[in-house]
């Protein structure tokens, strides 16, 4: 938890941020909260980024003030204007780019004082894997596919029956660059699978971890998948 303290000559206010990750091409949120003020016109929010010329976003006197906004954020940022009065200074970032990664500062001025807190924002690509039985293969085979990952992840197979088993010898993983030349499609094939077993395809990079499960029995196939962002911590 990062708590910001004020500048001399004025009281300090508490500002809290949460480290987070953005999925490139999608919208992201940079979280920041502060001790609220009773008057919206007294609140100034400034978002800054290390190494950037100008501001990421500025909100003052109840509206956006973008005359000093950096070009790389133009048309891509917004605060939740109706929630500023209750202490929400979070920033919505549209169409997240790899280059948006870095250290951000949420800087707040209210009638009570000033405060700021830093936030580490990671960017990459992550997506839910889908595991299917590959009926085209000569032997019982599973195919795990996830459309968008960056940086290149690791892929590990596991099974409920053979817990702790190493499937690297009986699996093959490939990474195919997508058309935008950054993210990659992940395809992993597991050979010699047995019936009445649950297999998991786990994809992980330094931003996210995703798992696709498949349970294969003689009568049915059940699938489940989930995704978890890594290293999201409060500041």
């Amino acid at each position: 938890l990062i708590i910001g303290f004020g500048i001399s000559g004025r009281h300090s206010i508490t500002v809290t941020t949460v480290a987070s990750a953005g999925n490139i091409g999608e919208d992201g949120i940079l979280s920041c909260t502060f001790e609220p003020d009773i008057k919206l016109s007294d609140i100034v929010i400034q978002w800054l980024k290390e190494g950037v010329l100008g501001l990421v976003h500025e909100f003052k006197e109840g509206k956006d003030e973008l005359s000093e906004q950096d070009e790389m954020f133009r048309g891509r940022t917004a605060v939740f204007a109706d929630q500023v009065i209750v202490g929400n200074a979070s920033l919505r970032l549209k169409n997240v780019q790899l280059t948006d990664a870095g250290t951000y500062k949420c800087y707040i001025i209210t009638s009570k004082g000033k405060g700021n807190a830093n936030l580490e924002y990671k960017t990459g690509a992550f997506s839910m894997p889908e595991v299917n039985v590959d009926y085209n293969a000569s032997s019982e085979t599973l195919r795990c596919e996830a459309p968008r990952w960056f940086p290149q992840p690791t892929v590990v197979w596991a099974s409920q029956v053979d817990q702790g088993a190493n499937f690297s010898e009986v699996s093959n993983t490939s990474f195919e660059l997508n058309s935008e030349n950054v993210t990659m499609k992940v395809v992993s094939v597991l050979y010699n699978v047995t019936i009445n077993n649950t297999y998991s395809c786990m994809i992980e990079n330094d931003i996210a971890k995703a798992t696709g499960d498949i349970k294969v029995t003689e009568s049915e196939i059940k699938r489940r998948s989930h995704l978890q962002l890594l290293n999201s911590k409060a500041s």
Epitope: E50, G51, L53, G54, L55, S67, E68, Q69, D70, E71, M72, F73, R74, Q97, L98, T99, A101, G102, T123, E180, N181, V182
Partner: antibody, heavy 119, light 107 residues
Framework: EVQLVESGGDLVKPGGSLKLSCAAS????????MSWVRQTPDKRLEWVAA????????YYPDSVKGRFTISRDTATNTLYLQMSTLKSEDTAMYYC????????????WGQGTLVTVSA | DILMTQSPSSMSVSLGDTVSITCHAS??????IGWLQRKPGKSFKGLIY???NLEDGVPSRFSGSGSGADYSLTISSLESEDFADYYC?????????FGGGTKLEIK
């Protein structure tokens, strides 16, 4: 069409001062961050100064900090570089550059103006 | 400061060839890299920004790739107008720093 035209380059003695100008046209001047970049006689490029869209934020490398000042005049669409306490290592071709709309740096360049610092 | 090491410093190539120029940053720069071109007798112009994106009006035979600290500019099917000087530049932190340049010459 984006046009950047530098002027003010000259031969000056070490310790002297000089003010470079860059006349900008073909775009909304107040909407773009601007920079000065120099190319030394050995062809190396060195970023010298940058100024934000509204002019409130300026940055310099340590090599010129305290000696060079970047400024802009929105009324006349002009970028300036005030150089003082000039040294022989400041000898270079100085270019005015404009950022791209998407946040790229050094998308557009002028033709340059030559500054020679010599006794 | 981030040091940008560009290679090669010069190369002789033929029309129609495909060439790659590389830049290594002294630390990861998260795609905050641009590539510039300077044709003989002309000024500089931006070619690529954010590692992979073409600036307006740049032909599609130019492409950028890379991640972390290593990036490259590739020109496929070289045309006569592509013989020029090329520079990389990082803009992840101040000061902005440039590579030493690559001179592309006709063989």
């Amino acid at each position: 069409e984006v046009q950047l035209v530098e002027s003010g380059g000259d031969l000056v003695k070490p310790g002297g001062s000089l003010k470079l100008s860059c006349a900008a046209s073909g775009f909304t001047f107040s909407s773009y961050g601007m920079s000065w970049v120099r190319q030394t006689p050995d062809k190396r490029l060195e970023w010298v100064a940058a100024i934000s869209t509204g002019g409130s934020y300026t940055y310099y490398p340590d090599s010129v900090k305290g000696r060079f000042t970047i400024s802009r005049d929105t009324a006349t669409n002009t970028l300036y570089l005030q150089m003082s306490t000039l040294k022989s290592e400041d000898t270079a071709m100085y270019y005015c550059t404009r950022r791209g709309a998407t946040g790229s740096w050094f998308a557009y360049w002028g033709q340059g103006t030559l500054v020679t610092v010599s006794a | 400061d981030i040091l940008m090491t560009q290679s090669p410093s010069s190369m002789s190539v033929s029309l129609g060839d495909t060439v790659s120029i590389t830049c290594h940053a002294s630390q990861g720069i998260n795609n905050n890299i641009g590539w510039l071109q300077r044709k003989p007798g002309k000024s500089f112009k931006g070619l690529i920004y954010h590692g992979t994106n073409l600036e307006d009006g740049v032909p599609s035979r130019f492409s950028g790739s890379g991640s972390g600290a290593d990036y490259s500019l590739t020109i496929s099917s070289l045309e006569s107008e592509d013989f020029a000087d090329y520079y990389c530049v990082q803009y992840v932190q101040f000061p902005r720093t440039f590579g030493g340049g690559t001179k592309l010459e006709i063989k």
